[in-house]
């Protein structure tokens, strides 16, 4: 009897696992083996698939054959017993086009009211992935154990910390990984739940703000109590991408090591330009917070975003307020990069009462004023860009005195 | 593990345009920030700037007017160029990581550049 | 640019011995100072980073110390590698800029 090709054969490609799967054509058939062939683009000669000869199943394992992954290649099957079934030829493919990403490996670690999460890749060096380790980035779903509420958190590192949990709660979560660049997701890892831990007597600091004043950054952030020390510590944001860079250390800022206030302040020209993350801990000599929140600190905005310079010209009801570059030290304007809007307070001398203006324009009429009084005017800038959203410190207060009645023309 | 290796003429004449290679492997130059420094032959060390993962770059006052810092990913590597050398440019000139701030984590062997007529 | 002073320019000492070696800033750097060894025909090694804090690997018998515009390095037991040129570096402003060096030799 003549024997029948196998039919409907399957590729599955997960990381560097590269597994086949096939239909028998005749079931009635006993003791039949498989064996595969491939052939490369542009070679003629079939060669024998190795770990895919003589196979009692249907399904084999062709891991170990050394592709290019980016190459195309065509595989055939065939069925053997006494004599052989004529070739079926499994449609051409590229390994990478193919492959879909394993699910990754996870560890956590809790703290009382935050959950640090590492995340790898499932294939440690694989070879699918080889040019693609840095743009992995992860998704995950986390759900209280006792309530089964789920939460999706997008677009993480392989590195990331979720805040504002609850102390002594265990909760689950799984992670999967995509390469956005490939349009590829993979799949979940296994589910991993942890407990967090008893609420720490002291809180971490919150509320870290970055801004810029006479060529330093002041790092302000809020605390709870009194008479404590903090330290605040610094780490390149492109790290947090990157799993296996043994540069991944958070370091101090001098100036910023052991500070009895709830500010800091250290030189721009410390940090070469980039984006950081910041953090803060407090302690009482006895005990130690967990750390705050992380804060990005992106230089080249921080330093740019200086308050902006404005001239007043006076008239009996209103002021024209034209707005300049910035001054950084030497006198000379910085350029701004990104588009801004400015932000006009003005109020009278002798009021409390505030009044402000949002414009676009860097020459803004301030109207409905009474003539020989004095209003005082300061103003800062913020960054349209949504992603960005960072805003300058007020400028200083000047205050002009209106003109008499008549000068409004 | 991070390793920087530079490369160069050896010897130039004064007016002339100097080109070093540095060369990393074990890291990508597309983190961190990668810069040069030189040491003159009485020992004396002078930061010349960097380029940063993002190609964003610095350079020291001193030398504005006659340097150049830039880097091609795909070859892993990124460069110097000097303009108008004079004997007061010969020296042993080293690249180097840095990480944020300006110290020096990871340097080359360094390379030596002799200027003379 | 800030001017690093470091002193002695060259010192010699036995095996066993603690040495200090000193920097003095003309402007105070917060502490914002490193640490570099370098041996005949090699690259320098950065041993010290914030004035004090050890880099991953460097042996516990070094230390760094200091505030203000004044800095040191202290070598306790010295090493028979411990032997060669120790700079200091500023990285409180820009350009960061390096002592003139000390030279240790064996006594």
């Known amino acids: 009897k003549n024997l029948k090709s196998p039919q409907k054969v399957e590729v599955d490609i997960i990381d560097d696992n590269f597994i086949l799967r096939w239909n028998r054509s005749d079931e009635s058939v006993g003791n039949v083996t498989f064996s595969f062939d491939y052939q490369k683009t542009g070679m003629d000669n079939w060669i024998k698939l190795s770990g895919c000869q003589n196979i009692t199943s249907t399904k084999c394992n062709f891991s170990s054959l050394k592709l290019n992954v980016y190459e195309e290649i065509k595989l055939r099957i065939r069925a053997e017993k006494e004599n052989t079934s004529s070739w079926y030829e499994v449609d051409s493919f590229t390994p990478f086009r193919k492959a879909q990403i394993g699910p990754p490996e996870v560890h956590l670690e809790a703290e009382d009211k935050a959950i640090v999460i590492h995340i790898s890749p499932g294939t440690k060096d694989s070879v699918m992935w080889a040019l693609d380790g840095l743009s992995f980035t992860y998704s995950l779903v986390i759900w209280k154990n006792s309530s089964g509420v789920e939460e999706r958190i997008e677009n993480i590192y392989s590195r990331h910390k979720i805040y504002k949990l609850s102390p002594e709660t265990t909760y689950c979560l799984k992670v999967k990984a995509a390469l956005l660049t490939s349009w590829k997701i993979g799949v979940y890892s296994p589910v991993h739940c942890i407990k967090t831990t008893v609420e720490n007597e002291l809180p971490p600091p919150e509320n870290i703000e970055v801004s810029v004043q006479n060529q330093n950054y002041v790092l302000k952030w809020d605390y709870t109590y009194a008479n404590m020390t903090f330290q605040v510590q610094w780490l390149h944001a492109f790290l947090k991408r990157n799993p296996g860079n043994h540069l991944y250390k958070w370091k101090q800022i001098p100036d910023c090591e052991n500070v009895k206030t709830t500010q800091c302040v250290f030189p721009q020209n410390v940090f070469q330009k980039g984006i950081y993350l910041l953090r803060v801990q407090a302690s009482d000599g006895n005990n130690t917070s967990f750390w705050s929140e992380e804060i990005k600190f992106d230089t080249e905005i921080q330093a740019f975003l200086l308050p902006p310079v404005f001239n007043i010209r006076s008239l009996s009801d209103s002021f024209h307020i034209y707005i300049g570059a910035p001054k950084q030290s030497g006198n000379t304007p910085v350029i701004q990069d990104y588009p801004l809007i400015y932000e006009i307070i003005f109020w009278e001398n002798t009021s409390n009462a505030e009044r402000k203006i949002i414009e676009k324009k860097t020459d803004v009429t301030v109207p409905n004023l009474k003539p020989l009084t004095v209003y005082c005017v300061k103003a800062r800038a913020h960054t349209m860009d949504e992603k960005l959203n960072k805003s300058s410190v007020f400028s200083d207060a000047v205050c002009e005195k209106t003109k008499p009645g008549n000068t409004s023309k | 593990e991070v390793q920087l290796q530079e490369s160069g003429p050896g010897l130039a004449k004064p007016s002339q345009t100097l080109s070093l290679t540095c060369s990393v492997t074990g890291y990508s130059i597309t983190s961190d920030y990668w810069n040069w420094i030189r040491k003159f032959p009485g020992n004396k060390l002078e930061y010349m700037g960097y380029?940063?993962?993002?190609?964003?770059?610095y350079y020291n006052p001193s030398l504005k007017s006659r340097i150049s810092i830039t880097r091609a990913t795909s070859k892993n590597q990124y460069y110097l160029q000097l303009n108008s050398v004079t004997n007061e440019d010969t020296a042993t000139y080293y690249c180097a990581r840095s990480g944020g701030m300006y110290y020096f984590d990871y340097w080359g062997q360094g390379t030596t550049l002799t200027v003379s007529s | 640019d800030i001017q690093m002073t470091q002193s002695p320019a060259s010192l010699s000492a036995s095996v066993g011995e603690t040495v200090t070696i000193t920097c003095r800033a003309s402007?105070?750097?917060?502490?914002?100072l490193a640490w570099y060894q370098q041996k005949q025909g090699k690259s320098p090694q950065l041993l010290v980073y914030n004035a004090k804090t050890l880099e991953d690997g460097v042996p516990s018998r070094f230390s760094g110390s200091g505030s203000g515009t004044q800095y040191s390095l202290k070598i306790n037991s010295l090493q028979p590698e411990d032997f060669g040129s120790y700079y200091c570096?500023?990285?409180?402003?820009?350009?960061?800029?390096f002592g003139s060096g000390t030279k240790l030799e064996i006594k």
């Open positions: 380029i940063s993962y993002s190609g964003s770059i």
């Open positions: 402007g105070n750097i917060h502490n914002y």
């Open positions: 570096q500023h990285f409180w402003s820009i350009p960061p800029t």
